[in-house]
């Protein structure tokens, strides 16, 4: 069974050293081999995937995952109840919404069941690991002859998100971008009616409710301009 795990682009860096350099290799036992790092992402606070690189193991190993929350009512050790697999080897754990407590320190322990001393424990701040779904329902309103307003929706508490709007015309080689706070609207004050514009938006769980570094996927683009303006000069909805 192969499970595809949604993770944003650019979140991995495989340049880290193999870090048993302080011990001679001939003295390594199984229990001193490092376990892979666990990386967790909370998707729209609906579920969380904690994954690891199972192929880094010297031989195929079904590593097990336990978790708990530090200093809380949820500090009882829990076993993973929904493993993710890569080529029939455990490579992650999925936690459901009821198991996610954003503002408590999440402790995750990876263990080799054949060598119980071989374990690694990590601590994570889940509020910094939230990735919202991409913005939806983009709409454009013509506020005046030369001014456009872009609106969108998020399937999350709007005040928790910041946004990045990108737009360009068919004449542009690159995107122009503008940061937008939790208000999820953007105005373009000067529009050239002879050009066709494309807009897209992405969102991030930052800075009011968390300090996430990762953005959502980009929304579907929406277009406005020369070849659409004759249809309805006041409202243009999503064009995929």
């Amino acid at each position: 069974l192969n499970t595809t795990i949604l993770t944003p682009n650019g979140n991995e860096d495989t340049t880290a050293d193999f870090f048993l350099t302080t011990m001679p290799t001939d003295s390594l036992s199984v229990s001193t081999l490092p376990l892979p790092e666990v990386q967790c992402f909370v998707f729209n606070v609906e579920y969380m995937n904690c994954t690891w690189n199972s192929s880094s193991e010297p031989q195929p190993t079904n590593l097990t995952l336990h978790y708990w929350y530090k200093n809380s009512d949820n500090d009882k050790v829990q076993k993973c109840s929904h493993y993710l697999f890569s080529e029939e080897i455990t490579s992650g754990c999925q936690l459901q919404k009821k198991e996610i407590h954003l503002y408590q320190t999440f402790v995750v322990q990876l263990q080799d069941p054949r060598e119980p001393r071989r374990q690694a424990t990590q601590m994570l701040k889940l509020q910094n690991l939230v990735i919202p779904w991409a913005p939806e329902n983009l709409t454009l309103h013509k506020l005046s002859e030369s001014q456009l307003e872009l609106n969108w929706n998020n399937r999350f508490l709007n005040h928790c998100l910041e946004h990045l709007v990108q737009y360009r015309t068919d004449w542009d080689h690159s995107w122009t971008e503008q940061s937008v706070d939790y208000r999820h609207k953007f105005s373009l004050p000067s529009v050239d009616g002879q050009k066709r514009y494309t807009f897209r938006v992405r969102s991030r769980f930052n800075p009011l409710c968390g300090s996430a570094q990762h953005w959502s996927e980009w929304s579907h683009p929406i277009h406005w301009g020369s070849n659409t303006s004759k249809e309805n000069p006041f409202l243009f909805a999503l064009e995929a």
Epitope: N11, E12, D13, T14, T15, A16, D17, F19, L20, T21, T22, S31, T32, P34, L35, E37, V38, Q39, C40, V107, Q109, R117, Q119, A120, T121, Q122, M123, L124, K125, N128, L129, Q213
Partner: nanobody
Framework: QVQLVESGGGLVQAGGSLRLSCAAS????????MGWFRQAPGKEREFVAV???????FYADSVEGRFTYSRDNAKSAVYLQMNSLQPEDTAVYYC????????????????????WGQGTQVTVSS
């Protein structure tokens, strides 16, 4: 290869303060998870404070609110400010480092750290 050297330990009265320093050489602190651990006589080594290179810091329950971890990447040094010290804080304090791929990785398990300092003794008298 990373070399770690701790300093700042000593004898202090209960309620007093100390600031431990850990100087790293051999490479920069970038992409290193760092930790402070301690070992009291006859006890296992335990984590005190750990930090991911992305900036998240975590403390053991017993020191939360009294100890503060900080990192100075420019000086390749990390620090542990220890206030309101108690006799039960008496131990050898160790600095540790682990290269990690992810900015969020902060290990509280001592066996996850590849590099260790020689330790500095902290004694708190009542």
């Amino acid at each position: 290869q990373v070399q770690l050297v701790e300093s700042g330990g000593g004898l202090v009265q209960a309620g007093g303060s100390l600031r431990l320093s850990c100087a790293a050489s051999g490479r920069t602190l970038s992409r290193l998870a760092m930790g402070w651990f301690r070992q009291a006589p006859g006890k296992e080594r335990e984590f005190v404070a750990v930090n991911s290179w992305g900036g998240d810091t975590f403390y053991a329950d017993s020191v939360e609110g009294r100890f503060t971890y900080s990192r100075d990447n420019a000086k390749s040094a990390v620090y542990l400010q220890m206030n309101s010290l108690q006799p039960e804080d008496t131990a050898v304090y160790y600095c540790a480092a682990a290269p990690t791929s992810f900015a969020t990785t902060a290990y509280s398990s001592s066996n996850s750290y590849a590099y260790w300092g020689q330790g500095t003794q902290v004694t708190v008298s009542s």
